[in-house]
């Protein structure tokens, strides 16, 4: 009886606080008045006071909103003592799992990425890789799963789809033939990273692709 299943609490809860989560209950309360307490990080050690317990009823309380990106799981111990202070139960493990909300936008690791590719290469040639991170959970939810896309290309010569980006790896590749350094020596791509696997919050960065010279022009006399 003196057992509590893991408790899931969403991060960024609105409250009002304190919020009752679960009730600790010892069946020894039939014989004597029981007082409950909790110990551990989040209770009586840093970060203190996140959780508390109503000592006479055993209600476990949340005192403030949780942040999964700060602490994803709390491990507390529940204690039950009689009026004279004698322990009536072994300490009970209480696991509190903080569930994720999509409260962070993706962030590119750089404002501007730079890469280069030889002029005249075949479609499919890899140019560079860009990376964005998202602090949200990407294992149990899509909140932190980032999808990449190209928003725009400048200049649009010889046309506006010279490059593509792999939506999950961020690898930028040539998609069209016609790269010609003598005509366009550099392309500026505005790239996007969107969480929720493409359905959430978006952030942008720039990828500059330099077109390198190939020995494709005969000398002129």
């Amino acid at each position: 009886d003196w057992v509590v299943a893991p408790i899931s609490v969403p991060e960024n809860g609105k409250g009002p606080f304190p919020q009752r989560l679960n009730q600790l209950k010892s069946n020894k309360d039939r014989d004597t008045k029981i007082f409950y307490s909790i110990t551990g990080p989040g209770a009586d050690s840093p970060p203190e006071g996140v959780f508390a317990v109503e000592k006479e009823t055993g209600w476990l309380l949340l005192n403030k909103p949780l942040d999964r990106e700060e602490i994803a799981k709390y491990e507390l111990f529940g204690h039950a003592v009689s009026e004279n202070g004698a322990s009536v139960e072994d300490p009970m493990n209480i696991s509190i799992i903080v569930t994720d909300q999509n409260d962070h936008k993706p962030k590119f690791t750089q404002d501007t990425f730079r890469g280069s590719v030889l002029e005249g290469v075949l479609p499919g040639t890899s140019v560079m890789q860009v990376t964005a991170t998202d602090e949200d959970d990407a294992i149990y939810t899509y909140n932190g799963v980032v999808a990449y896309s190209i928003h725009s290309q400048e200049p649009k010569d010889p046309h506006d789809l010279m490059f593509t980006i792999h939506r999950s790896t961020g690898t930028i590749s040539v998609i069209s033939s016609g790269l010609d350094r003598e005509k366009v020596p550099e392309y500026t791509l505005t790239i996007q990273a969107t969480d929720m696997d493409g359905d959430g919050s978006t952030t942008t960065a720039v990828a500059v692709v330099e077109i390198l010279d190939a020995n494709d022009n005969a000398p002129m006399f």
Epitope: N12, K14, P18, A52, E54, P65, D67
Partner: antibody, heavy 115, light 108 residues
Framework: EVQLVQSGAEVKKPGESLKISCKGS????????IGWVRQMPGKGLEWMGI????????RYSPSFQGQVTISADKSISTAYLQWSSLKASDTAMYYC????????WGQGTLVTVSS | EIVLTQSPGTLSLSPGERATLSCRAS???????LAWYQQKPGQAPRLLIY???SRATGIPDRFSGSGSGTDFTLTISRLEPEDFAVYYC?????????FGQGTKVEIK
Amino acid sequence: EVQLVQSGAEVKKPGESLKISCKGSGYSFTSYWIGWVRQMPGKGLEWMGIIYPGDSDTRYSPSFQGQVTISADKSISTAYLQWSSLKASDTAMYYCARHSFFDYWGQGTLVTVSS
Amino acid sequence: EIVLTQSPGTLSLSPGERATLSCRASQSVSSIYLAWYQQKPGQAPRLLIYGASSRATGIPDRFSGSGSGTDFTLTISRLEPEDFAVYYCQQYSSSPRTFGQGTKVEIK
């Protein structure tokens, strides 16, 4: 470091309007209720109301309902307290504070209403 | 609304003495919803105790809170010079989240 920084002191005439601010930093502004507390000269603390910046849910004390408006702009992590028509009796120090129990407080904004 | 009545209005004590401040509610308040604050002249209030007995971060252990139902107590075991101030209790179990009228602890 959690901080609540309030706008500066104001001197106004009766009948004028006013909006004072409270900017939060060092924590997730949208995840905590912000409350406003009045302290008239030489008097105690009075709970005016609270707002949840995440969705602008607002609760007022009956004593202040209709007298003031509490709002928030989550894009700039700022809560506001405003009056459409000030009275001399609104002269007081106004504090913003975070949470159900107020664990962090602003430095206060002194509002003086006098003709 | 819940009315909180603090007593005494003023407490005159010397440094090193024990201070006992009372807060009585007009109706029962769960102990988890009671807080104590300290306010010094020209300063914003500071949270001392929440949940009737839990000390806020950085509050010295000479401050302790107790009580349940309608009667709550803030105790300062040995008054330090910096403890002379006004103390307020507050309930946050129901709206409006009322404060007591305050107890001034002054140097005797």
